[in-house]
């Protein structure tokens, strides 16, 4: 068999709500998949779990079952939702979201995302890991071309 | 290290219009809002308003609605604010300002000012 | 607008005292988000402001443990607990909840 190849291209959006009393940031993560299928007969994509990391806390997991068939030699591209609660011990970071008098307010996430595929009774399973700045303190729609790749470890401008 | 550097004092006659210019250092205009402030002599300060220089949206003191008009060049890193009709009551030091932070650090920034007297 | 009454508009004191400086809102300036937008600003002769204190209470980078802020709703208060010369000026306070944001009218730290 060939190679199934996953590739995390990025965040899609992220859209925020807050609860003012519990002093909690509700973030909904989309994020997109490309899944190519490199062999010639179709595969199975039975799964996907993702989780969602901020300072080794994880603040979000989902996982879908029985996403799509993907075809000879084709690619699919699929976005998938993970709902985050930032909350209790990270309460500080409601303060920094809710910061009117700045526009921006970047967090670093790290998006971890699982593909499981089977054909023929095989099942097998794909990894990605992915470090990206989501905005807590607006809804944002971001371009995925522009910021496919970022770069955690340079300064924020 | 970041800085505004604003133009020049301005000296104009009563009824003119002037541009002035906010110049941003060590960091992009157009990733936070840019504020103006206003100061009359002897006296307090005014919001005038915000521009976020990235889709150049502003929201304006009604007070100075029609009279004030703030613009950005994201090319140059540069806001700009227009005051129209002048007249003595405009006689004042105007302020640039902005806010920028993360998660761990927030810095207020504000430029040296500039003067602007309306005088025939 | 909402406007921000501030007392007493000037206010000698001596090196050491105790200042305190109250700030009123015509109107609640709790944002819809829970957040009290509530700042304080010093102002000394021929500079720009600074901002001593956002959020009614938290002290900016820098700023000495000696002010403090309080109050909620539309009463507010800063608190010099030993007055220093370094920190006569003119203070404001700003609220940044409600647009247009407005300024107190100021408040004199002389000495006495």
């Known amino acids: 068999p060939r190679s199934i190849e996953v590739k995390y291209i990025g965040v899609k959006s992220a859209y925020v709500s807050y609860d003012a009393e519990k002093r909690t940031i509700y973030l909904n993560i989309t994020n997109t998949l490309n899944i190519t299928n490199n062999n010639y007969y179709s595969v199975e994509v039975e799964n996907i779990t993702a989780q969602v990391q901020f300072s080794k806390t994880v603040i979000g997991k989902a996982r879908l079952n029985n996403i799509t068939n993907i075809g000879p030699l084709d690619m699919k591209q699929i976005d998938y939702t993970v709902p985050t609660v930032i909350a209790e011990e990270m309460s500080y970071m409601y303060d920094f979201c809710t910061l009117l008098s700045i526009k921006v307010h970047n967090i670093v996430l790290m998006m971890q995302v699982t593909v499981t595929t089977a054909y023929f009774g095989h099942s097998e399973q794909i990894s990605q890991e992915r470090y990206q700045y989501v905005d807590c303190g607006r809804n944002t729609t971001y371009q995925l071309a522009q910021s496919e790749y970022l770069n955690v470890l340079q300064p924020q401008q | 290290d970041v800085q505004l550097q604003q133009s020049g004092a301005e000296l104009v006659r009563p009824g003119a219009s002037v541009k002035l210019s906010c110049t941003a250092s060590g960091f992009n205009i157009k990733d936070y809002y840019m504020y103006w402030v206003k100061q009359r002599p002897e006296q307090g300060l005014e919001w005038i308003g915000r521009?976020?220089?990235?889709?150049?949206?502003?929201e304006n003191a009604p007070k100075f609605r029609g009279m004030a008009t703030m613009t950005a060049d994201t090319s140059s890193n540069t806001a700009y604010l227009q005051l129209n009709s002048l007249t003595s009551e405009d006689t004042a030091v105007y302020y640039c300002?902005?806010?920028?932070?993360?998660?761990?650090?927030?810095?207020?920034?504000w430029g040296h000012g500039t003067s602007v007297t309306v005088s025939s | 607008d909402v406007l921000m009454t501030q007392t007493p508009l000037s206010l000698p004191v001596s090196l050491g005292d105790q200042a305190s400086i109250s700030c009123r809102s015509s109107q609640s300036i709790v944002h819809s988000n829970g957040n009290t937008y509530l700042e304080w600003y010093l102002q000394k002769p021929g500079q720009a402001p600074k901002l001593l204190i956002d959020k009614v209470f938290n002290r900016f980078s820098g700023v000495p443990d000696r002010f403090s802020g309080s109050g909620s709703g539309t009463d507010f208060t800063l608190k010099i607990s030993r007055v220093e010369a370094e920190d006569l000026g003119v203070y404001y306070c700003f609220q940044g909840s409600h647009v247009p944001f407005t300024f107190g009218s100021g408040t004199k730290l002389e000495i006495k």
């Open positions: 521009i976020d220089p990235e889709d150049g949206d502003t």
């Open positions: 300002t902005t806010r920028i932070g993360n998660l761990y650090h927030v810095m207020d920034y």
